[in-house]
Interface confidence: low
């Protein structure tokens, strides 16, 4: 709930945003922090054995509006969430895997597409 007198205007995007990065850290990152003119993201996807893997990092401004608004196709088993409101905001993002849709099944382990 907003406190009385608190502005309801959206927080302007910082010129340089710092994000937590995990599995998507650039070589020059320090302490698992990357910097971007765009968005922080957290993503969950399945690995080859069907286990969920969470990664996080920075998305550049160019093209990231499309990425972040683009909820993945359900059967991709991948979901990405983005934020810009403060530094390291992606620590608080918790995307969930969408359900299976039109997955190809083979004998034994699940075959991805």
């Amino acid at each position: 709930k907003k406190e009385d007198g608190e502005s309801t205007a959206p927080t302007p995007r910082p010129k340089v945003l710092r994000c937590k990065c995990h599995h998507h850290c650039p070589e020059d990152s320090v302490n698992n922090i990357c910097s971007t003119d765009g968005y922080c993201f957290t993503m969950i996807e399945e690995d080859d054995s069907g286990l969920p893997v969470v990664t996080s990092g920075c998305l550049g401004l160019e093209g990231s509006d499309f990425q972040c608004r683009d909820t993945p196709i359900p059967h991709q088993r991948r979901s990405i969430e983005c934020c810009t409101e403060r530094n390291e905001c992606n620590k608080d993002l918790h995307p969930t895997l969408p359900p299976l849709k039109n997955r190809d099944f083979v004998d034994g382990p699940i075959h991805h597409r």
Epitope: G60, G63, Q67, I73, P98, R113
Partner: antibody
Framework: QVTLKESGPGILQPSQTLSLTCSFS??????????VGWIRQPSGKGLEWLAH???????SYNPALKSRLTISKDTSNNQVFLKIASVVTADTATYYC????????WGQGTLVTVSA | DIVMSQSPSSLAVSVGEKVTMSCKSS????????????LAWYQQKPGQSPKLLIY???TRESGVPDRFTGSGSGTDFTLTISSVKAEDLAVYYC?????????FGAGTKLELK
């Protein structure tokens, strides 16, 4: 600014392998979530999705053509490739590449004619 | 596979007329987790590549005139042009991006009466 451009052989004979290249700028296939797809359109007919590739090298194919299709990418050179084996005259079409899974950006298309 | 059916296959219209065209899917395109319909509409003019008009069934792509409106949910969708202009004469395709294989409708051709 996102641009995509397809290139191909123009004409080839039945039973040959069709090799297509999609060269793009303004997007990177190393960006998490990014994907590029191939769609074709025979003259005067509708659109048919062929194949898709994601930044992490996941691939998806049209089941009706899967045995003949191979999609691949060269991330560093901003290119995606499609090969169609054992072409027949019914593969004559304009071939497009496009970004994403709802296709906000398309190339201009390249016409491929399969003729003996 | 999800089958997309469009009607009518062609439509003769006069400039200034209101036009509606239909797209039906063989299964629901509504994803309950985010309440979004995974449906897009494209316009293709002769000799040109298709152009994205509408995504999420009703969201207008940037730069698309507001005379184009997408509506519907689940399996029944409609594209409406409130007042047709000569430049709107084209073929209109719907496409589902709910699951692979991605599929298109056969198109509705808009012609001058």
């Amino acid at each position: 600014q996102v641009t995509l451009k397809e290139s191909g052989p123009g004409i080839l004979q039945p039973s040959q392998t069709l090799s297509l290249t999609c060269s793009f700028s303004g997007l990177s296939l190393s960006t998490p979530g990014m994907s590029v797809g191939w769609i074709r359109q025979p003259s005067g007919k509708g659109l048919e999705w062929l194949a898709h590739i994601w930044w992490n090298d996941d691939k998806s194919y049209n089941p009706a053509l899967k045995s003949r299709l191979t999609i691949s990418k060269d991330t560093s050179n901003n290119q995606v490739f499609l090969k169609i084996a054992s072409v027949v005259t019914a593969d004559t079409a304009t071939y497009y590449c496009a970004r994403g899974d709802r296709f906000a950006y398309w190339g201009q298309g390249t016409l491929v004619t399969v003729s003996a | 596979d999800i089958v997309m059916s469009q009607s009518p296959s062609s439509l003769a219209v006069s400039v200034g007329e209101k036009v509606t065209m239909s797209c039906k899917s063989s299964q629901s395109l509504l994803y309950s987790n985010n309440q979004k319909n995974y449906l897009a509409w494209y316009q293709q003019k002769p000799g040109q590549s298709p152009k994205l008009l509408i995504y999420w069934a009703s969201t207008r792509e940037s730069g698309v005139p507001d005379r184009f409106t997408g509506s519907g949910s689940g399996t029944d969708f409609t594209l409406t042009i409130s007042s047709v202009k000569a430049e709107d004469l084209a073929v209109y395709y719907c496409q589902q991006y709910y699951s692979f294989p991605l599929t298109f409708g056969a198109g509705t051709k808009l012609e001058l009466k």
